[in-house]
Interface confidence: low
């Protein structure tokens, strides 16, 4: 019986000591991982391609300029900050905001004026990946021109001037429904983040051929829902300490609880020419002993575990998160793949 | 010592049969779902909002309407599909085609001409995002205007028309340095894969002022890696079938194993109207029974246990593949935000 | 509170001018689509015409040359209009805030008020 | 003329079935997607419960859906109750001031 052959396997080699079957674990991992990563690709065998084909081959081109050069900022170095991606909290991708009252009386002219946009500590200016403001143009009775503007209210200048352009855009509308526009105010908002004290609102004007004014900027009845607002996408990518993490040791680490150990996987080693990039990356590999409720997996585990206590004859050292690596390479046909594979990287270990 | 305080606790309730224990593991997880969320979107206590407000902010616009939309498509219904989403193989995302022989003599007017692309079968029409070919142009001498025609080769049609125009565009160029241009021809390409032999090849032609075609289509001597060349982004789901996965039980199992039972979290039932969608979602958790290497998490496992037998006091059963939730949400500031919540569904139960 | 309520004949004889107002409350006119619609005793329902806030007017084919709609923004009204009456014309007129079929147009409908054309 | 087309002219099934009415368009809504569908009952006007093709209207309950694209829209009632005993209406607009009601799909609960 097979299963009973690994279990005998595993006893007679626990009598080694921590190196040796460190050691064992580590040239596993590497077996596995070149095994895998054929697997992964769908291929049978290596693909056979020599490196004055491949130099012939490769486009001196900007996209795959740009797919190589990814891979310098791409490298696992994680382990040697203090701070690493959090992968608990929520990322926000997406915030949509209303005009809200400003701290001033916003009025011009004596007439109060839309709008003004307060901001979240959380947005920082380079973390904007698009910023668009949304205004609602209400429905026209014949095909007409329309010229938005959006304005942006400035302290008043010695000429007394109140405002400065942020876009201007002309548009064609045809009768029977409004509909909404969106305009670009990134640059805006990052000068607005960068120095909250200019941000003292803006004006918006939508004007038809005849001069009136189209955009909803304060809502009459029936147009609940069609007020300007802000959508901002934002890249977030929250840190937080390691020490919340599993235990991260060294090849000379005398630690015997469940540990990531480092190990990279180096392609041109054994011969991968055909993989244009990476041509190496840090794998890492999980070791080492387990007690019960060291480490859980997810914060809420210990909750889990108290109410089930039924097959758990006790947590064991695994990855808790892996990652991808995105491979650049040639499929032997003449073709070049860039692509992603799945779970190729222990970022953390733990006991679950 | 808190420790045997908890093994005492797991002894006794191990007593307990397979419903209550499960019952208990569910109602744990609701309560470690509802306390992970505000902890995740770091709010000391839940939003308090009224549904009127709610009516009242949300915007009737289109950015707004894809979030909300989204929530439809992404339900976790993968538990009644026999096909899975596939987290082992790569996925695809970019592919480079090299210009090929064409399977016919592809000559005009007794000039052999550029270029025929070859696609894999791998590459299906609705899954290309976008297609862009990409064209050298020789440096020229003064600045000048560029006239880029890109023609399909068609079946000769009665008055003798090999050619149907796909793009044409208009470029000024300076004098110093060749360029790489880029022009889509998605439209073209979904064509071809949908209608394979349509596939008859391109001609490029890049003529300035003077009638000078400054394409690079025939590299000549120093212009290697110069080739026009197809750059084609893919969306790439491959599914997997179930069978290679965990297992599924329901609520009236008798399965002893580790198994993935369904469990649904409705936010609408303990009152969180500040959550604009999803208002419910499947949670799923973990519970049940490990054997030795039964349901190894990642294929090479095995080769590591043999390798690694201490601290493997036995595999537990165990979460192997969690995904996030998105939420669109109501921070109490007056922002709606759209994120990604890490690990909130259960996708796979394993051993490991 | 957002009402609309249609109000007009009961009773118009054959080649005469129907006349029906929809006077609304709640309801800006000036940023409101009308529409009117109508539905003859045990038939579906049919698209008559709309006033748009701006004042455009948009009608059925059928009704094209027999059908004026106004609107009287300080009154809060729309007024329907149909010359040359024939029995079947006979029907329950509807009017309607926006327009059914765009965006939630439709959401809100007056009680309807029943028009027999009869000599 | 555009015409709008619903089947069946009578739906008849007992409480908690699934109901599935249809809507054909001689051509193509304006963006594919200016579609409403509307419920009305004796003596009442109608009640508008899904707009944009999909979107359910504020107080409809989630056993309404609605689906299709360009010509072929469907309604859905997922779980029949007593109370939807009524007769359905699809709107179709095509822009230019253009809009169309099919002719009615009748459900009666058995």
């Known amino acids: 019986n097979e299963n009973s052959e690994q279990k005998e396997n595993v006893e007679k080699e626990g009598l080694c000591n921590a190196c040796t079957w460190r050691q064992n674990t580590k040239s596993s991992r590497i077996e596995a991982i070149k095994i895998q990563i054929l697997s992964k690709l769908r291929l049978e065998t290596a693909p056979n391609i020599s490196k004055d084909v491949i130099r012939q081959l490769l486009p001196k081109a900007p996209p795959l300029r740009e797919l190589i050069d990814q891979y310098d900022v791409q490298r696992d170095d994680s382990s040697d900050g203090s701070l690493e991606d959090d992968d608990y909290h929520a990322t926000t991708e997406t915030i949509i905001t209303m005009p809200t009252e400003s701290d001033f009386l916003m009025q011009v002219d004596g007439k109060p004026k839309c709008c003004f946009f307060k901001f979240s500590s959380k947005i920082q200016y380079n973390k904007v990946v698009k910023a668009q403001l949304w205004i609602y143009l209400r429905p026209v009775e014949t095909p007409t021109t329309v010229f938005v503007q959006i304005l942006r209210l400035i302290k008043p200048m010695k000429d007394g001037t109140r405002y400065t352009g942020i876009r201007s855009l002309k548009l064609d509308m045809n009768p029977g429904t409004g509909i909404w526009q969106s305009i670009d105010v990134k640059t805006v908002l990052q000068n607005w983040l960068k120095q909250p004290e200019s941000n003292l609102g803006i004006e918006i004007k939508a004007l038809d051929e005849n001069g009136h004014d189209l955009a909803v900027t304060f809502p009459g009845p029936g147009e609940d829902g069609l007020n300007p607002f802000l959508e901002v996408k934002v890249t977030d990518t929250p840190k937080r300490s390691r020490r919340d993490f599993g235990l991260d040791c060294d090849e000379h680490s005398t630690e015997s609880r469940c540990c990531r150990y480092p190990l990279t996987v180096d392609f041109e080693a054994f011969g991968w020419d055909w993989i244009i990039a990476p041509k190496r990356y840090k794998a890492n590999y999980c070791s080492g002993e387990c007690e019960f409720v060291f480490l859980q997996k997810y914060p809420h585990t210990h909750l889990v575990h108290q109410a089930n206590p039924r097959g758990s004859a006790g947590p064991c050292c695994t990855p808790t998160k892996m990652s991808p690596i995105n491979m650049l390479y040639f499929n032997g046909k003449e073709q070049i793949i860039y692509g992603k594979i799945p779970a190729m990287v222990v970022d953390r270990c733990g006991c679950s | 010592n808190e420790n045997s305080e908890q093994k005492e606790n797991v002894e006794k309730e191990g007593l307990c049969n397979a419903c209550t224990w499960r019952q208990n593991t569910k109602s744990s997880r609701i309560e470690a779902i509802k306390i992970q969320i505000l902890s995740k979107l770091r709010l000391e206590t839940a939003p308090n909002i009224s549904k009127d407000v709610i009516r009242q902010l949300l915007p009737k616009a289109p950015p707004l309407r894809e979030l909300i939309d989204q929530y439809d498509v992404q339900r976790d219904d993968s538990s009644d599909g026999s096909l899975e989403d596939d987290d082992y193989h790569a996925t695809t995302e970019t592919i480079i085609t090299m210009p090929t022989e064409s399977d016919f003599l592809m000559q005009v007017d007794g000039k052999p001409k550029c270029c025929f692309f070859k696609f894999s079968s791998k590459i299906q029409y609705n899954k290309v995002v976008k297609a862009q070919l990409w064209i050298y142009l020789r440096p020229v001498e003064t600045p000048t205007t560029v006239f880029v025609q890109i023609l399909r080769l068609i079946k000769p049609m009665k008055d003798g028309t090999r050619y149907t125009g796909i793009r044409s565009l208009k470029l000024d160029m300076n004098p110093g340095t060749g360029i790489w241009q880029s022009i889509d021809v998605k439209t073209v390409l979904q064509n071809w894969l949908k209608q394979p032999e349509s596939n008859l090849g391109i001609e490029i032609k890049a003529l300035d002022e003077n009638g000078h075609d400054l394409a690079v289509t025939f590299p000549g001597p120093g212009e290697d890696g110069l080739n026009p060349f197809l750059e084609v982004k893919v969306t790439d789901t491959p599914k997997r079938s179930r069978r290679d996965f965990g297992l599924d039980c329901d609520e009236h199992s008798t399965e002893s194993r580790c198994c993935r039972y369904p469990l649904t979290v409705d936010f609408e039932a303990f009152g969180w109207d500040w959550i604009i969608a999803p208002k419910r979602y499947k949670a799923n958790y973990c519970s049940g029974e490990c054997e030795f290497v039964f349901l190894q998490k990642y294929p090479h496992t095995h080769l590591v246990h043999q390798a690694n037998p201490r601290g493997s006091a036995g595999p537990c059963c165990t979460p192997t593949k969690m995904s996030p939730i998105n939420m669109l949400y109501f921070n109490g500031k007056e922002q709606i935000i759209y994120g990604k919540i890490p690990a909130m569904v259960v996708d796979r139960c394993g051993c490991s | 509170q957002v009402t609309l309520k249609e109000s007009g004949p009961v009773l118009v004889k054959p080649t005469e001018t129907l006349t029906l107002t929809c006077t609304v409350s709640?309801?800006?006119?000036?940023?409101?689509?009308i529409s009117w619609v109508r539905q003859a005793p045990g038939k579906g329902l049919e698209w008559v015409g709309i006033i748009s806030y701006a004042g455009s007017k948009y009608k059925a084919s059928w009704a094209k040359g027999r059908l004026t709609i106004s609107k009287d923004t300080s009154k809060n009204q729309v007024v329907l209009t149909m010359t040359n009456m024939d029995p079947v014309d006979t029907a329950t007129y509807y009017c309607?805030?926006?327009?059914?079929?765009?965006?939630?147009?439709?959401?809100?409908w007056g009680q309807g008020t029943l028009v027999t054309v009869s000599s | 003329d555009i015409v709008m087309t619903q089947s069946p002219a009578t739906l008849s099934l007992s409480p908690g079935e699934r109901a599935t009415l249809s809507c054909t368009s001689s051509q193509s809504v304006y963006h594919a997607n200016w579609l409403s569908w509307f419920q009305q009952k004796p003596g009442q006007p109608p009640k508008l419960l899904i707009y944009?093709?999909?979107t359910l209207a504020y107080g409809v309950p989630s056993r309404f859906s609605g689906s299709g694209s360009g010509t072929d829209f469907t309604l859905t009632i997922s779980s029949l109750q007593p109370e939807d005993a009524a007769t359905y209406y699809c709107?179709?607009?095509?822009?230019?001031?253009?809009?169309?009601f099919g002719q009615g799909t009748k459900v009666e609960i058995k």
């Open positions: 944009w093709a999909s």
């Open positions: 709107a179709g607009g095509y822009g230019g001031g253009r809009y169309a």
């Open positions: 709640g309801i800006d006119l000036s940023h409101t689509d």
């Open positions: 309607a805030r926006g327009v059914p079929a765009y965006s939630h147009g439709g959401d809100l």
